[in-house]
Amino acid sequence: VPLDPISVSNSSSQIILKWKPPSDPNGNITHYLVFWERQAEDSELFELDYCLKGLKLPSRTWSPPFESEDSQKHNQSEYEDSAGECCSCPKTDSQILKELEESSFRKTFEDYLHNVVFVPRKTSSGTGAEDPRPSRKRRSLGDVGNVTVAVPTVAAFPNTSSTSVPTSPEEHRPFEKVVNKESLVISGLRHFTGYRIELQACNQDTPEERCSVAAYVSARTMPEAKADDIVGPVTHEIFENNVVHLMWQEPKEPNGLIVLYEVSYRRYGDEELHLCVSRKHFALERGCRLRGLSPGNYSVRIRATSLAGNGSWTEPTYFYVTDYLDVPSNIAK
């Protein structure tokens, strides 16, 4: 298994992956295979009303660039607190002994994997965005999840009752073959998006490729600068009962997803008022309704807030509310 894989993002479309070669390889490592797949945002993020008091915006940080060659321990898995700046404690004698045992186990386990788990396949030609290797078959080991390294357990062995989470078919996952180096720049990724990266060491290229169990790492690309800006006009409809319906377009490719909109409006001469519009209410009205407006000239600005933070305020939109003096309304409240 490749050791200590770390991933960082240096732009909104790239992730840099680095690793160390296996400590006890079975033969010579001829190349590495790197697969990556986009991870969906947690569905709960789409459903929560972030305008409710006390509900904090979700914290989503991208994978920060390397500080130095040796700062790889700062790679964040989904289980780590991104705010927690922690360092490791000194190792005890029992831990050192345990690591030696694990190293020995790893070699034995890899031998087992080569002989039992993987069905060797014919050589593959070329690399590229689409995996041209549908012939490669792998028995289910159970999905390891977004941990940095896949640590095998007894439940991971075949013919046991481990439940595996289905992943997309391998032949549709982008991959790269890496020869003579322990790093890769993955390009062409979507901005502010989580990716799960799978890394395998292979000790034979032809006639049959033999590769290790995968190590996994997760990373998120950096945000795109203007992706959360509302483009196009903010339109308005003025109803007969001093209600104004504001409408705008959702940013096409936001950083992650838009969790809320802020509407800032003011009547000329008055102070600014703020309104929060959740995804749910935006989905209902494609905007929001300002009610009980006093007659006068108004200006309104809107900005979106995504998982990465705030977009820019729109240019002000202006409208005038006349004095209807309690004219009966046809609009249901």
Partner: antibody
């Protein structure tokens, strides 16, 4: 391909309970409001109510408030319409429809299920 | 309670033009009701034609157009075809997720 698929036709007796379903495919179900529409035999469309599957918030037409219950299970992308005690006058075709899909800037019922025929007869 | 009115029936010759309207028993229909129009052929689910007064839904032929005529919403079909023979419903959006449908117009292409 976005699709709303409704459960099959039902024949019930007055006083019985019933729950019909509408399953969404090909879009983020929990993030879109789903409405229910009734069409009695030979009659026009009547808007009944709407639900946001993400948190199950509902809005009802005054005519249907207290007569039916709209619910949803976002984990299986399904909305429901249910009656606790059916009447002969509930005999109708019931449609689910997605409110204002993102392709639509304004308010409209953009995508419809195929309908569920409910027959209530003694 | 808001009542939305439509002509119960209408006839048009093939190739002709017909305008169906959608009004309110009290008051006038404006763009702020976001009038939408639906076509329903017998035994089929309704299909949206126009939303937001005049925007055609994807895949809807351009012979269907929506507008406001006086104090009503209108759906105009130009160059009527035999398969336009259907029931047509308008819906007005009242805010807060609430719609009211009109009684429908049965269109016959003679």
């Amino acid at each position: 391909q976005m699709q709303l698929v409704q459960s099959g036709a039902e024949v019930k007796k007055p006083g019985e309970s019933l729950k019909i379903s509408c399953k969404g495919y090909g879009y983020r179900f929990s993030d879109n409001w789903i409405g229910w529409v009734r069409q009695m035999p030979g009659r026009g469309l009547e808007w009944m109510g709407i639900i946001y599957p993400g948190d199950s918030e509902t809005r009802y037409s005054p005519s249907f408030q207290g007569q039916v219950t709209i619910s949803a299970d976002k984990s299986i992308s399904t909305a429901y319409l249910q009656w606790s005690s059916l009447k002969a006058s509930d005999t109708a075709m019931y449609y689910c429809a997605r409110h204002a899909p993102l392709a639509v800037a304004g308010m409209a019922l953009g995508d419809w299920g195929q309908g569920t025929l409910v027959t209530v007869s003694s | 309670q808001t009542v939305v009115t439509q002509e119960p029936s209408f006839s048009v010759s093939p190739g002709g033009t017909v305008t169906l309207t959608c009004g309110l028993t009290s008051g006038s229909v404006s763009t702020s009701y976001y009038p939408s129009w639906y076509q329903q052929t017998p035994g089929q689910a309704p299909r949206m034609l126009v939303h937001s007064t005049s925007t055609r839904y994807s895949g809807v032929p351009d012979r269907f157009s929506g507008s406001i005529l006086g104090n009503k919403a209108a759906l105009t079909i130009t160059g009527a075809q035999a398969d336009d023979e259907s029931d047509y419903y308008c819906a007005l959006y009242m805010g807060g997720g609430i719609y009211v449908f009109g009684g429908g117009t049965q269109l016959t292409v003679l």
